[in-house]
Interface confidence: low
């Protein structure tokens, strides 16, 4: 069955953009002008998952790369990583749970909750140029709110 996808960029609530930091990590920092071209473009795919009125299951791939954000346990802690996949088989509607995030829209802000680890969210630090990570708290120091920009 076909998977619907759209291309977008994400900025955190502090307007930090997301860029590649090495081959398998994202970091968040403020970009301006031509530097905005460095930000990663996501291919957000609408996939199968737990349904509810306010949560939409999505997978977040990097456009034109066979990399997807995934959530795994490392040293007993839920961890965000970029995982390489076979481009012939991805994206697909029935993505493995580690690739699935519940996109939650509240007051025009988006949160991305791990389907594998409920109440853990894609997060950024207040500090500049720090890795994007999976955080277990909302409303604290770390930022879990994002805005999405449509990319053609």
């Amino acid at each position: 069955a076909p998977v619907r996808s759209l291309h977008c960029t994400l900025r955190d609530a502090q307007l930090k953009s997301l860029v590649m930091s090495g081959p398998y990590e994202l970091k968040a920092l403020h970009l301006q002008g031509q530097d905005l071209e460095q930000q990663v473009v996501f291919s957000m795919s609408f996939v199968q998952g737990e349904e509810s009125n306010d949560k939409i299951p999505v997978a977040l791939g990097l456009k034109a790369k066979n990399l997807y954000l995934s959530c795994v346990l490392k040293d007993d802690k839920p961890t965000l990583q970029l995982e390489s996949v076979d481009p012939k088989n991805y994206p697909k509607k029935k993505m493995e749970k580690r690739f699935v995030f519940n996109k939650i829209e509240i007051n025009n802000k988006l949160e991305f909750e791990s389907a594998q680890f409920p109440n853990w969210y894609i997060s950024t630090s207040q500090a500049e140029s720090m890795p994007v990570f999976l955080g277990g708290t909302r409303g604290g120091q770390d930022i879990t709110d994002f805005t999405m920009q449509f990319v053609s």
Epitope: A1, R4, L6, F46, E51, I56, K93, F150, V151, S152
Partner: antibody, heavy 120, light 107 residues
Framework: QVQLVQSGAEVKKPGASVKVSCKVS????????IEWVRQAPGKGLEWIGE????????NYNEKFKGKATITADTSTDTAYMELSSLRSEDTAVYYC?????????????WGQGTLVTVSA | DIKMTQSPSSMYASLGERVTITCKAS??????LSWFQQKPGKSPKTLIY???RLVDGVPSRFSGSASGQDYSLTISSLQYEDMGIYYC?????????FGGGTKLEIK
């Protein structure tokens, strides 16, 4: 509120083409899929295809490939469907509708329909 | 293509009666199913999406359910304004396909 306003009825000769427009207001045009559906007189509904105006992604029903061409103009918030090589069996009401990009929303808003009559 | 077999094709029911219309999908559609109502000379109106979610403004007497690949639309207490043609739609797999329609008339 959300509105989809379609162009008026058309009468065309067999072999001609027609371009139906669907002007959208009340939401961000680029973000949501526009669907095209047809209904022949006294018949049911048939899905033709869809476009996501923000990035130009298009999906067609194979049956209508070569018959329908779907486009969108984000500067005017208008979607178009052109039908070519018209035949009498293309006589139908053509509807545009919008669905949220979140996929599990289903069709939510519809245009008023455009009657295309193909007659010699 | 996925075939949506809708039944009955037409029916009469009395005001206040409970009415159920069904659609059977020829294969798994992952619950990606909508229901529409259409009145003569008018555009379709969406009632329900994703099997059971009511569109804003649709009366609560309308409900949707699923059992395997059988999908149902139920009107708990038929009102005069409910007459029209009802269609189901699967939007899981291209091409999206509609059921053949159920014409609902008042007895």
């Amino acid at each position: 509120q959300v509105q989809l306003v379609q162009s008026g009825a058309e009468v065309k000769k067999p072999g001609a083409s027609v371009k139906v427009s669907c002007k959208v207001s009340g939401y961000t045009f680029s973000r949501y899929w526009i669907e095209w559906v047809r209904q022949a007189p006294g018949k049911g509904l048939e899905w033709i295809g869809e476009i996501l105006p923000g990035n130009g992604n298009i999906n067609y029903n194979e049956k209508f490939k070569g018959k329908a061409t779907i486009t969108a103009d984000t500067s005017t918030d208008t979607a178009y469907m052109e039908l070519s090589s018209l035949r009498s069996e293309d006589t139908a009401v053509y509807y545009c509708s919008t669905i949220y990009y979140d996929y599990d929303q289903g069709f939510t808003y519809w245009g008023q329909g455009t009657l295309v009559t193909v007659s010699a | 293509d996925i075939k949506m077999t809708q039944s009955p094709s037409s029916m009469y029911a009395s005001l206040g009666e409970r009415v159920t219309i069904t659609c059977k999908a020829s294969q798994d559609i992952d619950r990606y199913l909508s229901w529409f109502q259409q009145k003569p000379g008018k555009s379709p109106k969406t009632l329900i999406y994703r099997v059971k979610r009511l569109v804003d403004g649709v009366p609560s007497r309308f409900s949707g359910s699923a059992s395997g690949q059988d999908y149902s639309l139920t009107i708990s207490s038929l009102q005069y304004e409910d007459m029209g043609i009802y269609y189901c739609l699967q939007y899981d797999e291209f091409p999206y396909t509609f059921g053949g329609g159920t014409k609902l008339e008042i007895k």
